[in-house]
Structure formats: C-alpha cells, structure tokens
C-alpha cells in the first residue's frame, strides 16, 4: 500500500467489569477490540470499513495497560494499510468486546458481548507525530493515539509520490522527504542518470559513463581530451586539430617522413664523399674519384674513372692502367691526335679549327655537347645543383630545378613563408601550408584572401517560383533554382504543359535555329581549346616560370590535407579536361573553404555524440546519394580561379569550396 493508518492502544479502564447492556462479566470482562476505519462521514453509519478493519486478541481483563508489541499476535500499534491517496479525513470506530472463548481469535467466538464503543471523525495529515486522545463514557475510559505514515518508497502529503532509491544504470539517487530525487555524489540530471565528468573534461571532445571520468571522442587524447591525435600515417609531426600532420622541424612531406637534414642526422656518405639533402631518398652522395655506390662505399678499379680519351680502351694493371688507343690517337690517355680537320673528326655539328700549322685540331662544340670530338652529351645535373630535395632536369642548353613544395629559387635554396607578407585581409588568419598560404576568414568575409564582403543570402528574397528549392551559388549573389516537375526556367517560372493550339511551324524554326547556334558555339570553343592546349612536357617545363599568381591556381595533391573524414575531390572544368581530375584519398582542410564560413547551415555533428567541428560553419547542399559527389563547374585553364567540391565528413551532405 501507499500508506498506513497506525492506532496505538494505551490503556483501557472498566473498573466495574460491566457490559454495554448493563450486565456484568463473569468472572471479569476478557476484553478485545474491533477497529473500523472508513471515509469521513458526518454521521457514522454501519456498512463496510472502506479504509480497512482489524481485530485484536484478548488484551486484558476489565482494566489494563496495553504494551507496545512489534510482532506476532497482539501487535501494538495496530496497522491499517491503505492503497490509495490519503484524503486527509477519516472516520474511526473503536469497539471493546468481551469474549468468553478463545484468547487468540476471539472475534470468531460465539457469545461475544459489546463493552463500549467510540467514534472519531475528523481530519488527519500524513506525518510522524502521534495524535493522542482519551474517550470516556459512564463505565469505561480508553486512552489511545494514532497517525498516518507513508509506506516505504511513498512520499508526499498524501503518500501518492513513489520514489525508490537506486544506484544502477537507470539512476543514482536517494529520496527527499517530499519524494523528490536527491542525486548521489557525481551524478546529475532529472533522473540522476548523467555522470558528472572529470572537472575540466572538454565539453565537445570528451564524455563519461561514470563520475570523474573523461573519455575522449575519436581524434582526441589526454586527461581532459583537449589534445589532438595526429594522422595515422604521420611520422614526425604533430597536430592542432585531429588527424593533422604538421611536421617537426627538419621534416617534410605529406606524412612528415622526409628528412630535410638527412645528411646531418645520418652521415650516410662514405670515403670523403659529399652529401646533399636531395634526391628520392632525401640525400645524394657525390663520390670522390675512385669510389662508387649509393654511399660511395665501393672502391673502383683504376680504369673506373675512364682515363682513356678518344675511345681508347683501358686495361687494369697492378698499380696503374694502360690505354689502348684507336687509330689516329696516341699518348698515355690517347689524348694526342694524328687526325687533322681534313678527317672531319668533330661529331654532332662541332666545327673544326686547325692548330699547330695544321698538324692537329680542336673541335668547337655546339650547346649540349662536349669532349675533344663533341662526342659526349652534356649532363648539367651531375653536380646535384638543386637544394632541399629539388629535382634537376636537363633542358636543352640549360638545366632547371623543380622545387619541392615550400621551396623556391634557382636552386630551390629559398624557403617560402607566404604568411610573412600578411596576405589575409579583414583580420583573416593565415596558415602557411606546403603549397602556399590559406586564409581562414572571419564571419562576413570570403575569398582566397578574405577580400570579399558577404552581402546577403541570394535565396533570402525567395527568387524561385512554383515551389522550387533555392540553393545559394558559389558566390554570395548567385542562386540556383531546383524546379519541381512540370516547370522550367532559371526561376522555374515557365510551365512545361503545351497550350491547346500549338504553333508547330514557329517552334520548329526556333528549335532549328537554337540547334545551329549551339553547334556553332561548340565549334568555336573546340577550336579555342585546341589552340590553348600545349604538350605535357612544355607545360611541365613552364612550371618554375609561373608567376606567383598563376602558381596559386595550381592544386597539388599534397596540399589537400583533411583533418576530418577523407572523401574524394572532383573538379569539372567544362570542355577542357586537360586541367581536370579526381583527387582521391587526399585530404582537405576545412580552411580550404574560407569563403563560406559563417554562412547558413548547422555545425557538423557526429550522430550520437555531438562532436562539433568548431566555429567554422560550412554551407550545406543536400545530396540524395550517400557517396555525395557534387562537381562545381569551373572555367577553362586561363581563368583566375578553379572551383572545387569538398566532400565533407557528414553522410549525405556536401560543402562547396570556392576560389582555392
């Protein structure tokens, strides 16, 4: 039940041992009580004891004191449990009876006689305090007290509030006197089922399943989950946001696995050879004469240095070598010639000059050729002139150094720090990436250098008709209307349905003219594209000669670092496919979409953990397909900007990045 009415019998006095009918009990009145508790009645009437009834065993003869007894027969106080909301009012009938029979169950005995009865009507609030009373009539006196208390787990003024203390998965609390929950230490929430995490545990990056715990969400670590975890493939780098790989000093490459100071750290070159921090392994050894091998670890034979000139063949001898000269040559190294200009000894277009009155000659070689007979092609890369891992390329009469990202100069000797010239306008934050600066713009600005002030949302004016969906375009003032079935036009303003009398002839002529016009435009574009297209080698050769402005328009794969979920990047450049491609498994930083930050949409969320992506709020485009590939259309290769579609970490959502 929800509560208990308790009645404590204290003393009964019947000095003369009389019954209610005036007769006396023989030998004395063996007294027991019947109690009936019912709803409040102004006039007590017979009928069921609606709130409960109880009988006692024989408690004494004539006059006696009733002792408290907690268990067994004759329990005192008497308990009348109820299973409803206590109304606050009641009627109580206490009857004293005499039994000639059984002491323990006298109510069932025949020949019982009423001694006296009392009736109490009134109000009674739930509480622990006993209300004491005494009732007298001409023959008897009864002293008693009573109260209403709530059963275990029931609380409140009417015992109607159930509260059972618990410490399990569903809650961790005790119950207040009014039935409200009192959370155990370390727990909070309406039902005390939310743990209070370790003090300082990061709100977004951390959570807990029990008090004073701080469990980190993917990508975060540490006691308070406020330190990021670098990318899985990262070798010598750190991070400022999860899965980043920012190289430690002296390391380079996408995963910071290229030692920019390999020579100093490892001294790989042997036998006095020269080490330079370049080449595919991060270093190159230039051997002294008489040594070879990747690390100049192998001693050469005496002939290894090719001492015989003019095609002479070398023979190793014990401590030296011997040159066997071809016809027309003599000397220790076959360096002297018996030929003259008359014998046309100069190869590869070399011109012959007579010397010593015609007894010998000298060849003047064209560019790219050398040797006494212009027989050798010049290799200008043998001296490893390119620093910092630059690649040397022979280019006709000269050579060029193709620098690794982050370096410039004729020999790649200069390190680029693009942020030094403060390229970001309007308080934008500059990030010095390997392939140039990237600006993170404050709210209200966009563009490569945060130079564009975002004026308004082009969709705010509701430009699309007939229930079409409006999407903001790639610049703040652009919009695109997605028309419902049956409507066309840039604003979906034209219905597709045909009118009853249709002017077929006029329409046919119109359509024909449009088709001709489209074909003409396609021919012009194709011709223009063919004229623009250059061979691969030529464009590669031009790489080092690009202006800074043009270089900024290139998107090297290594620059595309993503600190989130890595999806694929599609760039669609209209008809000119030569400058397009899909960059797969490369990663993109949020910062590559600076122009869109702070415009519409919700911050990215993990589904069950509120993992926020920070203050950056990218524009969202809905996509039907889970793989979500949206290609932004960009202009041909002579355009100023390339537009890029960045596939975000969320399922079914896209972010458009502009002006990379």
């Amino acid at each position: 039940g929800s509560g208990i009415f308790q009645l404590r019998l204290q003393e009964f006095v019947n000095q003369r041992g009389m019954l209610a009918n005036g007769q006396s009990c023989e030998p004395g009145c063996r007294t027991f009580f019947r109690i009936c508790l019912k709803h409040f009645q102004a006039t007590f009437s017979e009928g069921p004891c609606t709130f409960g009834n109880v009988s006692t065993p024989v408690l004494g003869t004539n006059s006696f004191v009733v002792r408290d007894k907690n268990s067994g027969s004759g329990r005192n106080p008497l308990q009348l449990p109820f299973n409803f909301t206590w109304p606050g009012t009641f009627s109580l009938n206490i009857q004293a009876w005499h039994t000639p029979g059984d002491d323990l169950r006298p109510e069932t005995s025949p020949g019982n006689s009423l001694i006296s009865q009392i009736i109490i009507q009134g109000s009674l609030a739930v509480g622990k305090i006993w209300r004491t009373d005494e009732q007298n009539d001409t023959l008897t006196r009864l002293s008693y007290s009573y109260r209403v208390i709530c059963s275990d787990n029931y609380y409140g003024e009417s015992c109607s509030r159930l509260c059972k203390k618990r410490d399990d998965h569903f809650g961790h609390y005790e119950c207040q006197p009014d039935g409200s929950l009192s959370c155990l230490p370390g727990w909070t929430g309406k039902y005390c089922d939310q743990p209070i995490c370790l003090s300082g545990c990061h709100e977004q990056n951390g959570y807990c399943s029990k008090p004073d715990e701080c469990i980190c969400r993917p990508g975060w670590q540490g006691r308070l989950c406020n330190e990021c975890i670098p990318h899985n493939g990262c070798r010598h780098g750190t991070c400022s946001i999860p899965w980043q790989c920012a190289c430690d000093e002296g390391w380079g490459g996408l995963f910071c696995d290229q030692d920019l100071n390999y020579c100093t750290h490892h001294s790989p070159c042997k036998n006095g050879s020269t080490c330079s921090n370049s080449g595919p392994k991060g270093y190159t050894c230039t051997c002294l004469p008489g040594y070879t091998g990747e690390h100049c670890e192998l001693g050469l034979s005496k002939c290894a240095s090719n001492p015989c000139r003019n095609g002479g063949s070398c023979k190793d001898q014990e401590n030296s070598y011997h040159c066997l000269c071809p016809p027309g040559y003599y000397g220790q190294h076959c360096e002297h010639s018996t030929l003259t200009c008359a014998d046309s000894p100069c190869f590869n277009g070399g011109s012959c000059r007579e010397r010593n009155q015609g007894s010998s000659y000298a060849c003047e070689c064209p560019p790219n050729f050398t040797g006494s007979n212009c027989e050798k092609k010049v290799d200008r890369c043998t001296s490893n002139p390119c620093a910092n891992g630059g690649q040397c390329q022979n280019r006709g009469p000269s050579r060029t150094c193709r620098c690794r990202p982050g370096f410039t100069g004729t020999h790649c000797e200069l390190h680029i720090s693009d942020c030094a010239r403060s390229p970001c306008a309007h308080g934008g934050t500059c990030h010095d990436l390997e392939n140039g600066p990237v600006c993170t713009c404050p709210a209200g600005f966009s563009g490569r250098r945060c130079e564009v002030r975002i004026t308004h949302d082009a969709c705010a004016s509701g430009p699309c008709f007939n229930g079409a969906t409006c999407y903001t375009g790639l610049s703040p003032n652009n919009f695109v209307c997605n028309c419902p079935y049956g409507f066309v036009g840039s604003r979906c303003e034209f219905p597709v349905g045909l009118p009853p009398s249709f002017p077929w002839v006029a329409v046919s002529l119109g359509v024909g003219l449009v088709v001709l016009l489209v074909l003409l435009v396609m021919v012009v574009v194709a011709v223009r594209q063919l004229r623009l297209r250059r061979p691969d080698d030529e464009s590669r050769e031009a790489m080092n000669n690009l202006s800074d402005f043009q270089k900024d328009n290139l998107i090297p794969a290594a620059q595309l670092k993503n600190t989130n979920q890595k999806k694929e990047l599609e760039v669609d450049c209209g008809l000119d496919k030569s400058n397009c491609g899909k960059l797969q498994n490369h990663t993109l930083d949020y910062n590559l979409a600076p122009g869109l930050l702070g415009r519409g949409g919700m911050p990215g969320k993990y589904p069950h953990s509120d993992k926020s992506l920070g203050e950056k709020v990218p524009l969202r485009l809905h996509s039907e397909k889970p793989e979500c590939r949206i290609s932004a259309i960009c202009s041909p290769r002579d355009s100023m900007y390339q537009s890029v579609c960045l596939i975000s970490e969320e399922r079914n959502e896209c972010v458009i990045a502009t002006e990379v």
Epitope: P218, Q221, G222, R223, I229, N232, H236, G237, Q565
Partner: antibody
C-alpha cells in the same frame, strides 16, 4: 621506417609478474599515443591498455585493471607494460601498437609471447 | 562493450575473385571502424580506417564501405598475397573491440 620491437615475454607461474618493453623508432615517439593489444593462441585480438602522448593518461580493459600498468619513457622512445598477479587467461602474444582507444592502430610490433602456467 | 560480428568466419576463393567480408556492430559506431590483415605468425597490418580510407601503402583493390552498424570490406581482385585473416575493429566506444576474424583461404 616505423619499427616497434617488443621484449620481456616468457613463461611465468600464475600470480607472478612480468614487465614487457617496446622500443620504438622511425617516428617521433613523444608525439603519439601508444597501446598494448594481445592475442590468445588461436584467438582474436583484444585491446589491453592505452597511454596518451601528452600527459601520460592511461586506460585499461576491465579484466586487467589494478593488475597491469602501462607507462612510457619518451626520452628512451620506450613503452612498458608491468603485469602483476598474472592468470592463465592472460596467456597471449602481446603486441605494442601505435594508437589510442579511440583511433585505429596504425603500426604494430612483431609481438612477444607471455605464457602463464604452473 | 560493443560486440563486433564478422561473417563469414572463413571463406575459400581463387586468385582474381571479388571477395566481400561483412562486419556488424551491436550499436551505432558512426564510421569509426578499421580493417586489419594478419598472416600466420605475423602481426596485424592496418588496411582501412574511418570505414573507407586506405592506409598508407595499401593496394587500391581493397575498399571499405558502410556506416552505423553494417560495414563491408571488399577485395576487387584477389591476389596470392591476400590470403590471410581479416579483422574489423570499432574505436567509437571504450573499450575498442575487434571482430572474431574471417579466414580467407585458397580454393
């Protein structure tokens, strides 16, 4: 090349102790969280413990809490697992791995066998 | 703990075959799932992380897909060196848990 080399495994009686070591090279050890993962003979993989790179915060699977202690020495590029009160069910090949409890394990050592038997 | 259930537990295939292994999580783990390859007597090797991202140096014939509770590892054209045991692992909840493994054998 990233290399993780475990040592310290062997035969030990139930209730005994063992200390496993892992020597790391080929990456900046102090920048990365580390873990121990074990594999009982003929069974699957089971994460044992993790330590963060930054402040040395540690986490353990319930069955080893209070018995195992993971630690690291960034100056020595080393990871350790102190195993006390060993039980028969701790018998496994113990792998040192680079990763946290909430990230994939990108690199693994060759493993060291711990046998708990009387 | 999150239970990871792989199916099948073993499978036989031939060189050149397209093979699919599935992994089911007992709760939503978003995309925080990795796949590993383990050859007898060797340590596991990370193949795929974040459900579909290839680890460094892993051939493109391996691919992953899925999200939430159901995930798939696909090998588009089996090579002789691909015969091994494959494990999935979730790292969305503590403790991180692995699947029981799928043994890929030569038919």
């Amino acid at each position: 090349e990233v290399q993780l080399v475990e040592s310290g495994g062997g035969l030990v009686q139930p209730g005994g102790s063992l200390r496993l070591s892992c020597a790391a090279s080929g990456f900046t050890f102090s920048n990365f969280p580390m873990a121990w993962v074990r594999q009982a003979p003929g069974k699957g993989l089971e994460w044992v413990a993790t330590i963060s790179s930054s402040d040395g915060t540690t986490y353990y699977r319930d069955s080893v809490k209070g018995r195992f202690t993971i630690s690291r020495d960034n100056a020595k590029n080393s990871l350790y697992l102190q195993m006390n009160s060993l039980r028969a069910e701790d018998t496994a090949v113990y792998y040192c791995a680079r990763g946290y409890y909430n990230s994939p394990f990108a690199y693994w050592g060759q493993g060291t066998l711990v046998t708990v038997s009387s | 703990d999150i239970q990871m259930t792989q199916s099948p537990s073993s499978l036989s295939a031939s060189v050149g075959d397209r093979v699919t292994i599935t992994c089911r999580a007992s709760q939503d783990i978003y995309i925080n799932l990795a796949w590993y390859q383990q050859k007898p007597g060797k340590s596991p090797k990370l193949l795929i992380f974040d459900t579909n991202d290839l680890a460094d140096g892993v051939p493109s014939r391996f691919s992953g897909s899925g999200s939430g509770t159901d995930f798939t590892l696909t090998i588009s054209s089996l090579q002789p060196e691909d015969f091994a045991t494959y494990y999935c692992q979730q790292y969305d909840y503590v403790p991180p848990t692995f699947g029981q493994g799928t043994k890929l054998e030569i038919k």
